[in-house]
Interface confidence: low
């Protein structure tokens, strides 16, 4: 029983993770160590987004009675996205000299991009296992939205009639989780 | 600013129960989790389970299965432990500790002495 | 459970001093490691998160390495506020298990 108590950890992040997601979302800080953006000069508390940033998770999954054996890696998309200037490790760097101002990039949040599915295991206190389809993010992008979209910072797709599985994330703010769905 | 605080110290005798409490103020205490760690006399730290306060889901260190209770009140931001059956060897610091960016046990309460004795 | 070994259990030093304390896993625990402070009386404090990385607010003489089930914590010139014990934490599996602590103090 390799898991002897569990409910869901919390994910780490990279360096200085933003006080805030850029979207209105707020996620549970991440988890178990929780890492922080590379030299970025930023202190981890600071309020200031440093721009759409991969941040690479790692966390336990649970519904609330079982949890994942072992911990699921992944990437969380946090951050805004500010002016090119101001970015040296900007993701979508693609739209060339695209110049946003400060202003407009209110309108651009950093969301998923790519994403994989896989299976994971999760073992249950009476010692018996469930399997749950999970997509996990694997890039992110920056994406332009309009006031309707609001999206929320979890995702879950659990097709038990247990709790949703949560994701546990303590190392970040970050948004867009994963989705879950039972398999 | 996070910050736990938790009850003051309590002095038991063996057989009986002990509840400690642990208010949170700061940060968003529904999406969190709060686990307690205890540590005896001159000893280790030893995490005795957590709770996950926006669905009251608990998890706890197999040794103290049965005998340990984690419950959270939404409404007052407050999270308890309390532990049944007690004996001597329970005597120790009891803390509450909230998860964060830097761990499971990034913000911490004050400590709470729980001495048991006849 | 996962077994965190520390060593050694204390030591003495003096204040400038390089000092390493040991973490060793009874398994493969990945990088999912912690680091601790604790001084007389009062709760402990993290230092060290995902085994490397610096924790908010702590200076920078501390760092930590390793990966896999060996681990070190490092405080390149001991300092007189320095003086505490040390715990090393695993969260790959639960429950959540803490080494039995690495007490510092002045030589």
């Known amino acids: 029983f390799k898991n002897d108590a569990t409910e869901i950890l919390y994910s780490h992040v990279v360096k200085p993770v933003p006080a805030h997601p850029s979207s209105n979302s707020t996620l549970n800080q991440a988890r178990n160590g929780g890492r922080h953006f590379s030299n970025t000069g930023l202190d981890r508390n600071t309020r200031v987004q440093v721009g759409c940033r991969e941040l690479r998770s790692t966390k336990y999954i649970s519904d609330g009675q079982c949890t994942s054996i072992s911990p699921l890696k992944e990437l969380v998309c946090a951050g805004e996205c500010l002016p090119l200037p101001v970015l040296p490790n900007w993701i979508g760097g693609g739209y060339g000299t695209k110049y946003w101002s400060r202003r407009s990039s209110q309108e651009w949040r950093c969301v998923n991009d790519k994403t994989r599915t896989q299976r994971i295991q999760l073992q249950c206190q009476d010692g018996s296992t469930r399997t749950y389809k999970i997509t996990v993010v694997t890039a992110c992008k920056c994406k332009r939205y309009t006031r309707q979209h609001n999206e929320s910072s979890h995702n879950f797709e659990s097709m038990s009639p247990a709790k949703p599985v949560q994701h546990h994330r303590e190392r970040k703010r970050a948004s867009k989780s994963s989705k879950h769905s039972m398999s | 600013q996070v910050q736990l605080v938790q009850s003051g110290a309590e002095v038991k005798k063996p057989g009986s129960s002990v509840k400690v409490s642990c208010k949170a103020s700061g940060g968003t205490f529904s999406s969190t989790y709060i686990s307690w760690v205890r540590q005896a006399p001159g000893q280790g730290l030893e995490w005795m389970g957590w709770?996950?306060?926006?669905?009251?889901?608990?998890r706890y260190n197999r040794k103290f299965t049965g005998r340990v209770t984690i419950t959270a009140d939404e409404s007052t931001s407050t999270a308890y432990m309390e532990l049944s059956s007690l004996r001597s060897e329970d005597t120790a610091v009891y803390y509450c500790a909230r998860e964060g960016v830097d761990g499971w046990f990034t913000y911490w309460g004050q400590g709470t002495l729980v001495t048991v004795s006849s | 459970d996962i077994q965190m070994t520390q060593s050694p259990s204390s030591l003495s030093a003096s204040i400038g001093d390089r000092v390493t304390i040991t973490c060793q896993a009874s398994?493969?625990?990945?990088?999912?490691l912690n680091w601790y402070q604790q001084k007389q009386g009062k709760a402990p404090k993290v230092l060290i998160f995902?085994?490397?990385n610096l924790a908010a607010g702590v200076p920078s003489r501390f760092s930590g390495s390793g990966s896999g089930t060996d681990f070190t914590l490092t405080i390149s010139s001991l300092q007189p506020e320095d003086i505490a014990t040390y715990y090393c934490?695993?969260?790959?599996?639960?429950?959540?298990?803490f080494g039995q602590g690495t007490k510092v103090d002045n030589k």
């Open positions: 934490q695993q969260y790959d599996n639960l429950p959540l298990t």
């Open positions: 398994q493969d625990i990945n990088n999912y």
């Open positions: 709770i996950y306060a926006g669905t009251g889901g608990t």
């Open positions: 995902d085994a490397s």
